[in-house]
Interface confidence: low
């Protein structure tokens, strides 16, 4: 942290005689300038040149040849780094009066003569002396305004809306100012400051329109920073609207918007009087052309349990706005005949969400799924299949015998989505089948007993259990099952020896 | 912005009953599903009841089942839990959560949570 | 009702670094998973929904992967913030919506 510079004469104000030459010291540990009260233009006879010396600080010397009522004023040194636009200057002050007694107040530029004030704020009428002895007073139409008066800056208070004439007296000599203009203007002490962008998304062509809006406050300067600023591609637009309250609107149109106006959209609104500053910003995108995104929130094959309420939904992406659909197997989804609903439903500007709705899924509700989006520009699809998960079922258990062989075949015909695995087991002692410890798993590779399983189509199968030789009465049982669960069915299977007795008796 | 509080917890003997509500703002409150959410002390999140849009489709969890009831006031963009019976094991933080408007559901905004304390 | 189960209870690891969380599921499903993250004493917030898709507002060093039955949060450069508790959750077989038990998140 620098210690502020030092300023030789080592003084709060100095008078210096007219046509006479000043010089003012600066001394810092960094490089250091100087802001003085004449513009640049008026500044020929101010000279400021860096000097060298042996104590290690920087020096500059600010000179004045031949002193007028112009150079009275404030003279600041400050380190160069330090300055921002928005700051007030930090440094070191010394204020320099130069009486001249032709010249009581010192000259102003004609925006010094409007002074703004903010509501029942307090202002200053600034018409300062040449010298700090000077008396001065304040008229208005009425006589004289009762105000407080500092010669560096000028009359200090609350004044009414009206013009405003200095007087000041030198040597017997009356002096006057041209009238100042007090104007009050609506003000507050924050920003209400409000962006809006009806669209964010674009094509090529189009018109960008971006307004803002100050609410309450006639004393603001508003700026726009945008990519097409430096190509001067923006029109600017300010709408004063007074009722119910005051409200400006400024509108900034970039006709023809291409790819590269893409990008961040600024308006800086800034207090005149105060250092109030607020900033809002929104992002516009410019598009070759138009274009869309499809985004589902599920795979390409999904399963929906039986009687199952089930949503599907898709995220879109697309401007302009799309037109969206659904096919079931390529065919238009004709809603009115199904417990199948879509919607379409938009979130945000470019945003769209379109739900399929199953109600209770049903076997035929199966099949292939495509939502459809498009627009002037593209068209996008996705297509997912559906399976609708059935309970496995058993449709058939039937024997078939061989003949004189004694073999003989059981068939088991099941149905289910997915499809069912077919599982045979085998009681041997037909007394003790009620109890399940009698029934066996029937493997694979058991000699004289073929299995085998044929899948008829997507949803049925069948599976087939071949006895070489039936000598016993056995019971043998077909379990199906899949996921959503399991039916089984048993059959007995009476040896030929036993069936013909039978048939005999 | 979109927000939810929840409120009417406190300690209350077993047996006892409370109403909890929740306050939804920011958002279209009859477009959403939601859901209450409770997490007791030191242990991990527990679902309790989920109640549709419309609150015509409700779930309960086995362990509050015939003892809580969920329902909805759209008209006051308000979400309620009606506890009776209530014991020790159902001391916790109750969230109430909106379902998001995505397929897979995610809770995607919560309350701050209020307090059910369950002890004689 | 499906069962999650999630891997590593708890978990030491440094600013920086890759970590991943692990949830299995009792029953395989496409998608319907979602991350959440809590802090002590705030209540939990909406990472990853649809098994991968990053809810709006939430830093891209997190993402999610997985189906059938095994799900996967990971981070991959851990921040400070980043120190919490994790849960998934089902939504694919309701009810009940079911969480897994948690992970805790410490720093090393």
């Known amino acids: 942290q620098l210690s502020l510079p030092s300023i030789l004469p080592n003084e709060n104000e100095k008078v210096v005689q007219l046509n006479s030459s000043f010089s003012l010291r600066c001394f810092g540990e960094s490089e250091v300038s100087w802001q003085y009260p004449m513009s640049e233009e008026e500044s020929s006879d101010v000279e400021i040149r860096n000097e060298e010396n042996n104590s290690g600080l920087f020096v500059t010397v600010l000179e004045v040849s031949s002193a007028s009522a112009a150079h009275t004023g404030l003279y600041t040194c400050y380190y160069n780094h330090t300055q921002t636009e928005e700051n007030e200057l930090e440094g070191r002050h010394i204020y320099i009066y130069v009486p001249d007694p032709d010249v009581a107040f010192v000259p102003l530029g004609m925006t010094d003569y409007l002074v703004i004030v903010e509501d029942d704020d307090s202002a200053i009428i600034p018409c300062r002396t040449t010298d700090p002895e000077t008396p001065v007073t304040l008229h208005n139409s009425e006589g004289v305004v009762p105000a407080s008066y500092d010669s560096r800056q000028g009359f200090n208070g609350t004044f009414t809306v009206g013009p405003y004439i200095c007087e000041a007296t030198v040597k017997g000599k009356k002096f006057q100012t041209i009238p100042f203009n007090v104007y009050a203007l609506k003000a507050t002490s924050e920003l209400d400051l409000e962006m809006e962008a009806l669209k964010t998304v674009y094509k090529s062509g189009e018109t960008i329109v971006v307004t803002c809006a100050v609410f309450n406050n006639e004393v603001v300067d508003l700026q726009w920073t945008y990519p097409g600023e430096v190509k001067g591609k923006g029109i600017t637009m300010l709408e004063e609207i007074k009722v119910p309250s005051i409200k400006l609107v400024y509108t900034l149109t970039v006709p023809e918007a291409t790819v590269k106006d893409s990008g961040d959209y600024e308006c800086a609104a800034r207090q005149a009087t105060r250092e109030v500053k607020e900033m809002k910003k929104v992002t516009i995108s410019v598009h070759e052309k138009g274009f869309i995104e499809i985004k589902p929130t599920f795979s390409q094959l999904e399963a929906v349990n039986l009687h199952e309420v089930k949503h599907f939904v898709v995220e879109v992406r697309a401007y302009p706005p799309p037109r969206i659909s659904w096919l079931k197997n390529n065919l238009t989804l004709i809603e009115n005949l199904t417990e199948i609903t879509t919607d379409v439903e938009k979130i945000q500007e470019i945003r769209y969400r379109s739900k399929l709705k199953l109600i209770r899924a049903k076997e035929e509700d199966s099949g292939h799924y495509t939502i459809v989006a498009q627009n002037e520009d593209a068209v996008k699809s996705y297509t997912f299949e559906l399976l609708t998960q059935v309970p496995s079922s058993i449709l058939d258990l039937v024997d078939d015998h061989h003949g004189s062989t004694g073999g003989q075949t059981v068939r088991c015909t099941a149905e289910g989505t997915p499809l069912p695995d077919i599982e045979w087991m085998i009681c041997k002692d037909i007394k003790k089948c009620n109890n399940e410890t009698s029934w066996t798993i029937l493997a694979n590779n058991v000699s004289n007993i073929i299995t085998e399983i044929h899948s008829r189509d997507r949803s049925t199968v069948e599976g087939r259990v071949t006895f070489a030789k039936v000598e016993e009465t056995i019971a043998v049982r077909c379990l199906a099952k899949n996921l959503l669960g399991a039916e089984n069915r048993e059959l007995k299977l009476v040896a030929p020896t036993l069936r013909s007795e039978l048939t005999v008796a | 912005q979109v927000q939810l509080v929840e409120s009417g917890g406190g300690l209350v003997k077993p047996g006892g009953s409370l109403r909890l509500s929740c306050a939804a703002s920011g958002f279209t409150f009859s477009d959403y599903y939601m859901n209450w959410i409770r997490q007791a002390p030191g242990k991990g999140l527990e679902w309790v009841s989920f109640i549709s849009s419309s609150g015509s489709t409700i779930y309960y969890a086995d362990s509050v089942k015939g003892r809580f009831t969920i329902s909805r006031d759209n008209a006051k963009n308000s979400l309620y839990l009606q506890m009776n019976s209530l014991r020790a094991e159902d001391t916790a933080v109750y969230y109430c959560?909106?379902?998001?408007?995505?397929?897979?559901?995610?809770?995607?905004?919560w309350g701050q949570g209020t307090t059910v304390t369950v002890s004689s | 009702d499906i069962q999650m189960t999630q891997s590593p209870s708890s978990l030491s690891a440094s600013v920086g670094d890759r970590v991943t969380i692990t949830c299995r599921a009792s029953?395989?499903?496409?998608?319907?998973i979602n991350w959440y993250q809590q802090k002590p004493g705030k209540a939990p917030k909406l990472l990853i929904y649809a098994a991968s898709s990053l809810q709006g507002g939430v830093p891209s060093r997190f993402s999610g992967s997985g189906s059938g039955t095994d799900f996967t949060l990971a981070i991959s450069s851990l921040q400070p913030e980043d120190f919490a508790t994790y849960y998934c959750?089902?939504?694919?077989?309701?009810?009940?919506?079911?969480f897994g038990q948690g992970t805790r998140l410490e720093i090393k």
């Open positions: 959560a909106r379902d998001g408007h995505i397929a897979a559901r995610g809770m995607d905004v």
């Open positions: 959750q089902q939504t694919y077989s309701t009810p009940p919506i079911t």
């Open positions: 029953q395989s499903f496409s998608r319907y």
